[in-house]
């Protein structure tokens, strides 16, 4: 977890004199507890926005938007911490909106929003705009919670963003797989336009069952620069094993931005299909 | 312009089956994780379940886990909710939304964010 361009960070709006500052997640008001506290955020949304470094990358980021209720709290209300937990790892990160100048009321209702909170590819995030000052401990709560589920390098947006592309994304490698004669398996799949190795992941199932029957690894050597974009062709021999006839086929890249942590792509052949068979009728009648 | 066309309601007998269906136009489909969400007679709007752009993840309400189940047609631009073992109190319009942001908002944290586009379809359990 961080935040995108961190001095490019402000809260500041008409009538209102705010800063951003970096926050422990521990605000001052949980230890020392104040007598009058605002009220909860209202109509807290998190979208999924994508914003571009100074450096052209693109990166996914979390964009939070909240108003505040329309009561005199406001009176009492001295900024706003968000927090991004990140829900696999708890990691937490958190920032302070300090508001330098007193709230008043006006002819709309108030609206704040940040658009820092770089966000992960296929992670889930619980994002939490809680007002300071933070209640007392029996207080009603003032904070706003919600979950957010980022796509991952598949979904066409977060595709072209940079960890995403650093990951591989761009790459189809089309893969085909058929099966021949003699217990083997033909994969055909379209080079990258890089000169880097890859790998074949065989891994073959019973019918109706997930426990692998046979596994198989096939190294495929850096191609050449006329090589690229064209088509592999390997064929691979399985064990000769009844039933054991679903086969998924994987191919692990290793290209230079990603190593051995690149997206891989796979395919899967099924069994083939049983036909049924009737019981034959006989065509004579047994006496006995 | 969003457009969500819900289908498949009626009247059952409690313990009988339902499927529900939706279908959209007005907006890439199969970048968008979509929920179904409900209202009893009387009441507010309830979540029911969600589903994410892919089908890779999926959310239900706690009280209809294993009762209901979602899933979605992206070349066909449908989502569906199939509904068995129904109960009275499972009597509301249903609604399909799509989630307000190309991620997911998930655990139906984001019912108060939902909008609301089609006209529903009337789901009635009663004997």
């Known amino acids: 977890l961080r935040l995108l361009d961190h001095r490019a960070l402000v809260c500041s709006q008409p009538g209102l004199n705010c800063t951003v500052k970096n926050s422990t997640c521990l605000d001052d008001s949980w230890i020392h507890p104040r007598n009058l506290t605002p009220s909860s955020p209202k109509d807290l949304q998190i979208q999924l926005h994508f914003a571009h470094t100074q450096q052209g990358d693109l990166f996914p980021v979390a964009h939070i938007e909240w108003t505040l209720q329309t009561d005199a709290s406001i009176l009492y209300l001295e900024g706003a911490e968000l927090s991004v937990l990140q829900l696999n790892t708890n990691e937490r990160l958190c920032v302070r909106f300090e508001f330098l100048s007193k709230l008043r009321h006006h002819h709309r209702r108030w609206r704040f929003t940040f658009s820092h909170f770089v966000v992960d590819p296929d992670q889930e995030y619980e994002v939490t705009v809680h007002h300071l000052p933070k209640p007392i401990p029996d207080g009603d709560p003032n904070h706003q919670s919600k979950n957010f589920l980022v796509p991952d390098c598949e979904h066409a947006r977060m595709k072209v963003t940079t960890p995403c592309m650093s990951s591989g994304s761009l790459w189809d490698p089309n893969i085909t797989v058929e099966t021949l004669e003699a217990h083997q398996l033909r994969v055909s799949f379209t080079l990258w336009n890089e000169s880097t190795h890859y790998q074949i992941l065989l891994t073959s199932f019973p019918h109706m069952e997930n426990h692998s029957c046979f596994e198989h690894m096939h190294h495929i050597p850096a191609p050449r620069p006329e090589e690229f974009h064209q088509r592999s062709n390997v064929t691979l021999t399985l064990r000769n094993l009844k039933g054991c006839c679903r086969h998924q086929v994987q191919i692990q890249p290793f290209f230079s931005s990603c190593l051995n942590d690149c997206l891989r792509h796979s395919a899967t052949v099924s069994c083939p299909e049983m036909p049924d068979t009737p019981e034959p009728i006989p065509d004579y009648m047994p006496l006995w | 312009e969003v457009q969500l066309v819900e289908s498949g309601g009626g009247l059952v007998q409690p313990g009988r089956s339902l499927r529900l269906s939706c279908a959209a136009s007005?907006?890439?489909?199969?970048?968008?994780?979509m929920h179904w969400v409900r209202q009893p007679p009387g009441k507010g709007l309830e979540w029911v379940s969600g589903?994410?752009?892919?089908?890779?993840?999926?959310d239900y309400a706690d009280s209809l886990k294993g009762r209901f189940t979602i899933s979605r047609d992206n070349a066909n631009n449908s989502l569906y909710l199939q509904m068995n073992s129904l109960r009275a109190e499972d009597t509301a319009m249903y609604y399909c939304?799509?989630?307000?942001?190309?991620?997911?908002?998930?655990?139906?944290?984001?019912?108060?964010?939902?909008?609301?586009r089609g006209q529903g379809t009337m789901v009635t359990v009663s004997s």
């Open positions: 939304v799509k989630d307000p942001s190309l991620g997911y908002c998930s655990g139906g944290t984001c019912s108060d964010s939902f909008d609301i």
């Open positions: 589903i994410s752009w892919n089908g890779g993840r999926i």
């Open positions: 007005g907006f890439t489909f199969g970048d968008y994780a």
